[in-house]
């Protein structure tokens, strides 16, 4: 049973490693909220599906952040 | 390199508390999850506790009410009170895999070699 | 809490020979959340699989998860002498964290 009820954060471990952006499925980035006081980023990756927590703080991740949305950029008409 | 090391364990009186502690090592401690887990003598693995990489939030057995965790010390703690006959074991503590979530579980990919615990009159 | 099974309590095997290590679970686990681990003698436990199928780093070949649902099992597909050890899952899918309770692969 969680200590606190109220808090719903989802990632247990961070992971400050880089992600190669043509791996990625999808990229979720969570804002704070009165349910997770932090911001929290969620990669899907392509193999397997699997969930990874990424480190918000990492400049690595920051990098990601930036190649995805200039990428999304990309493709908007 | 990558290293946990416990300490805190030994012989004590049932009623009595304990604070078990876990040194991390070589990783960026404040990035991960951690865990307790103990084992009896001749018996299984038990699953403790686990506190989240910022310490917010905190999962339990039955057994144990006191995982805690201070970042600035890179330690992981394990306050044992009311200790009885049956709290006597081996207590590792253990990393949680990098990235892991409530959708995703990487397993605990670092362990420490366990710190032993006798609870006796 | 979730239960989980493993059979068989003992294994015998030769080196050489196909492991097939089965664990169940008492109410459905995410295939994300199973993991499985080998402890030796005097050690500490060690990482093989997480995600029901994912080896571990550094975790050889010859090591391999599959399942889902309730029904998972660990395979050892030629055994090596290293390899005689317990053997436990432990699902993630809900607190409190269980493992199973061991299979022993014994040397025959």
């Known amino acids: 049973v969680p200590l606190s009820r109220t808090v719903r954060c989802t990632c247990i471990s961070i992971s400050n490693q880089p992600v190669n952006p043509r791996s990625l499925e999808k990229l979720e980035i969570i804002p704070a909220s009165q349910f997770c006081p932090r911001v929290e980023i969620i990669a899907t990756m392509k193999k397997k599906g699997e969930k990874r927590c990424l480190n918000p703080e990492s400049k690595a991740i920051k990098n990601l952040l930036k190649a995805v949305s200039k990428e999304r950029s990309k493709r908007s008409p | 390199q990558v290293q946990l090391v416990e300490s805190g364990g030994g012989v004590v009186q049932p009623g009595r508390s304990l604070r078990l502690s876990c040194a991390a090592s070589?990783?960026?401690?404040?990035?991960?999850?951690m865990h307790w887990v103990r084992q009896a003598p001749g018996k299984g693995l038990e699953w403790v506790a686990v506190?989240?990489?910022?310490?917010s939030i905190k999962y339990y057995a039955d057994s144990v009410k006191g995982i805690s965790r201070d970042n600035s010390k890179n330690t992981l703690y394990l306050q044992m009170n009311s200790l009885r006959a049956e709290d006597t074991a081996v207590y590792y503590c253990?990393?949680?895999?990098?990235?892991?979530?409530?959708?995703?579980?990487?397993?605990?990919?670092?362990w420490g070699q366990g710190t032993t615990v006798t609870v006796s009159s | 809490e979730i239960v989980l099974t493993q059979s068989p309590g003992t294994l015998s095997l030769s080196p050489g020979e196909r492991a097939t290590l089965s664990c169940r679970a008492s109410?459905?686990?995410?295939?994300?959340?199973l993991a499985w681990y080998q402890q030796k003698p005097g050690q500490a436990p060690r990482l093989l699989i997480y995600?029901?199928?994912s080896r571990a780093t550094g975790i050889p070949g010859r090591f391999s998860g599959s399942g889902s649902g309730t029904d998972f099992t660990l395979t050892i597909s030629r055994l090596e002498p290293e390899d005689f050890a317990v053997y436990y899952c432990?699902?993630?899918?809900?607190?409190?964290?269980?493992f199973g309770q061991g299979t022993k692969l014994e040397i025959k």
């Open positions: 253990a990393r949680e895999g990098a990235g892991s979530s409530l959708y995703y579980y990487y397993g605990m990919d670092v």
């Open positions: 070589g990783f960026t401690f404040s990035s991960y999850g």
């Open positions: 506190i989240w990489f910022e310490g």
């Open positions: 109410q459905s686990v995410s295939s994300g959340h």
């Open positions: 995600g029901a199928s």
């Open positions: 432990q699902q993630y899918g809900s607190s409190p964290y269980t």
